[in-house]
C-alpha cells in the first residue's frame, strides 16, 4: 500500500481541519487507514481520524480540533494497520479555508433595490469574524451570458444592487463565498445558491 499524493490539509480556523490525499490504488479508506494527529504541546494526546473515501483512490479525513491559535502545530501520521505510510506536520493557521457563509437571502420588497444578506459563518469571538470579505456571484439561468461577481470588501454581510441593472421578468441566482485577507486564506466554498424572480419595472416616464 502506497501514498500517491501526500495529505494536504486546510483548517476552518474553528473546529475542523480537512485533510485529503490519494492512494496508489483503490482503497477502502475507512477500513484500511487511520490518520493520527497530535498537537505539539505539553501533555497532549494522540487523536485518531477515520478517513472516508473521496473517489476511487482518494481519501478525506475531518480532524476535530479545539479552537485554533497561531502557535498550534500538529504532527500527522498516516497508518495502514501497523505500517506507517506517511509522516508530516500541519500548522492550521497557515492553511486556512474559511467556512462558507450561510443563510443567503434576497429581499426584493425594497424599492428599486435588490438586497442580498447572508450570515458570517463565525462567532464574534473567532479571529476571522472581523476579517472576512466576500464575493457575491449573480447569474441568470434565462440569460447564460449574464454572470457577475460583486466584491464586498466591507464587513457588513450585505449587498445592494439597483434592480434596474437586472433584466425584468427573468429569474436570477446568487451565491456567496468568503476569504480572510490578514490570514492569507483561500476562498471558502460557495454558499448554497438562492433564486429570485426580478419583477422590477422602470417607471413609465423612464421607459
Amino acid at each position: 500500500m502506497k501514498v500517491l499524493q501526500e495529505p494536504a490539509c486546510v483548517s476552518d480556523y474553528m473546529s475542523i481541519s480537512t485533510c485529503e490525499w490519494k492512494m496508489g490504488g483503490p482503497t477502502n479508506c475507512s477500513a484500511e487507514l487511520r490518520l493520527l494527529y497530535q498537537l505539539v504541546f505539553q501533555s497532549s494526546e494522540t487523536h485518531t481520524c477515520v478517513p472516508e473515501n473521496n473517489g476511487g483512490v482518494g481519501c478525506v479525513c475531518h480532524l476535530l480540533m479545539d479552537d485554533v491559535v497561531s502557535m498550534d502545530n500538529y504532527t500527522l501520521d498516516l497508518w495502514a494497520g501497523q505500517q506507517l505510510l506517511w509522516k508530516g506536520s500541519f500548522k492550521p493557521s497557515e492553511h486556512v479555508k474559511p467556512r462558507a457563509p450561510g443563510n443567503l437571502t434576497v429581499h426584493t420588497n425594497v424599492s428599486d433595490t435588490v438586497l442580498l444578506t447572508w450570515s458570517n459563518p463565525y462567532p464574534p469571538d473567532n479571529y476571522l469574524y472581523n476579517d472576512l470579505t466576500y464575493a457575491v456571484n449573480i447569474w441568470s439561468e434565462n440569460d447564460p451570458a449574464y454572470s457577475r461577481i460583486h466584491n464586498v470588501t466591507y464587513l457588513k454581510p450585505t449587498l445592494r444592487i439597483p434592480a434596474s441593472t437586472l433584466k425584468s421578468g427573468i429569474s436570477y441566482r446568487a451565491r456567496v463565498r468568503a476569504w480572510a485577507q490578514h490570514y492569507n486564506t483561500t476562498w471558502s466554498e460557495w454558499s448554497p445558491s438562492t433564486k429570485w424572480y426580478n419583477s422590477y419595472r422602470e417607471p413609465f416616464e423612464q421607459r
Epitope: Q42, S44, V69, M71, D72
Partner: antibody, heavy 125, light 112 residues
Framework: EVQLVESGGGLEQPGGSLRLSCAGS????????MTWVRQAPGKGLEWVSS????????YYADSVKGRFTISRDNSKNTLYLQMNSLRAEDTAVYYC??????????????????WGQGTTVTVSS | DIVMTQSPLSLPVTPGEPASISCRSS???????????VDWYLQKSGQSPQLLIY???KRASGVPDRFSGSGSGTDFTLKISRVEAEDVGFYYC?????????FGQGTKLEIK
C-alpha cells in the same frame, strides 16, 4: 471532594529504591495529566515528572531521568513514582498534583489545582 | 530550561496594606492571546502549596478577590490589594508552558 493522597515515603539508603503512590478521588482521573513536585528541607519547589492522562506522554527533570519512573493505573485512579538509585539529594517532601485536562485536542490548563498532603522521602546511610 | 526570577525574596507588610510580587521569565510564556502559562502558588507553613492564579490572571476557585495576577510575555505580577494575617507564607511563580516546569525561588511574605 477532589482529593489526592500520597503514600510510600520513608527512610532509604543511598542506592536504594522506593515507590510512591498517589490515589485520586472526586474527579475523572484518566482525563487529567498528573505531576510530581518535590521540596527539599528548607528549599523551594522543584518539578520532578509529569504524565498525560493516557500515560502515553511522560516527562522528567534531568536530575531524575534514568532513575525515576512515573506511571499511572487509571483503573485504580492511582499515580506512581518508582524511585531507583536514590541519592542524598533526593531527600524531600514529594507532592503529587492534578495537572491539565489532557483528553481535549489542546489540553485545558487550570493550574496545578489540587495537591496531595505530601510524603517524606529521606535518603541517608 | 526557562528560568523564573522572583523579587523581592522577602516582603514584610502591614496588615491592610497592598503587596506586590514580581516574576520574570527567561523566555516568553504567551502561547496565544490571553494564555500566559504562568501560575502563582502560596505555601503556608507546614502545608502543601495551593493554587492562587493560573494562566497569568485567572483566579483559582475559592481564592479571595484581593489576589490578582497580571502581566504578559516575560513579566508577571501578583498583587494582594489588602494583606491579611492569614496570607503569610511563601509565594511561588511557576511556568507550565513546557517541561521542565520551573518555579521562582519563592517570596516570603511576613507581617510587620
Amino acid at each position: 471532594e477532589v482529593q489526592l493522597v500520597e503514600s510510600g515515603g520513608g527512610l532509604e539508603q543511598p542506592g536504594g529504591s522506593l515507590r510512591l503512590s498517589c490515589a485520586g478521588s472526586g474527579f475523572t482521573f484518566r482525563d487529567f495529566a498528573m505531576t510530581w513536585v518535590r521540596q527539599a528541607p528548607g528549599k523551594g519547589l522543584e518539578w520532578v515528572s509529569s504524565i498525560s492522562g493516557s500515560g502515553d506522554n511522560i516527562y522528567y527533570a534531568d536530575s531524575v531521568k534514568g532513575r525515576f519512573t512515573i506511571s499511572r493505573d487509571n483503573s485504580k485512579n492511582t499515580l506512581y513514582l518508582q524511585m531507583n538509585s536514590l541519592r542524598a539529594e533526593d531527600t524531600a517532601v514529594y507532592y503529587c498534583a492534578k495537572d491539565r485536562l489532557s483528553v481535549t485536542v489542546r489540553p485545558r490548563y487550570y493550574g496545578l489545582d489540587v495537591w496531595g498532603q505530601g510524603t517524606t522521602v529521606t535518603v541517608s546511610s | 530550561d526557562i528560568v523564573m526570577t522572583q523579587s523581592p525574596l522577602s516582603l514584610p507588610v502591614t496588615p491592610g496594606e497592598p503587596a506586590s510580587i514580581s516574576c520574570r521569565s527567561s523566555q516568553g510564556l504567551l502561547y496565544s492571546i490571553g494564555y500566559n502559562y504562568v501560575d502563582w502558588y502560596l505555601q503556608k507553613s507546614g502545608q502543601s502549596p495551593q493554587l492562587l492564579i493560573y494562566l497569568g490572571n485567572k483566579r483559582a476557585s475559592g481564592v479571595p478577590d484581593r489576589f490578582s495576577g497580571s502581566g504578559s510575555g516575560t513579566d508577571f505580577t501578583l498583587k494582594i490589594s489588602r494583606v491579611e494575617a492569614e496570607d503569610v507564607g511563601f509565594y511561588y511563580c511557576m511556568q507550565s508552558l513546557q517541561t521542565p516546569y520551573t518555579f521562582g525561588q519563592g517570596t516570603k511574605l511576613e507581617i510587620k
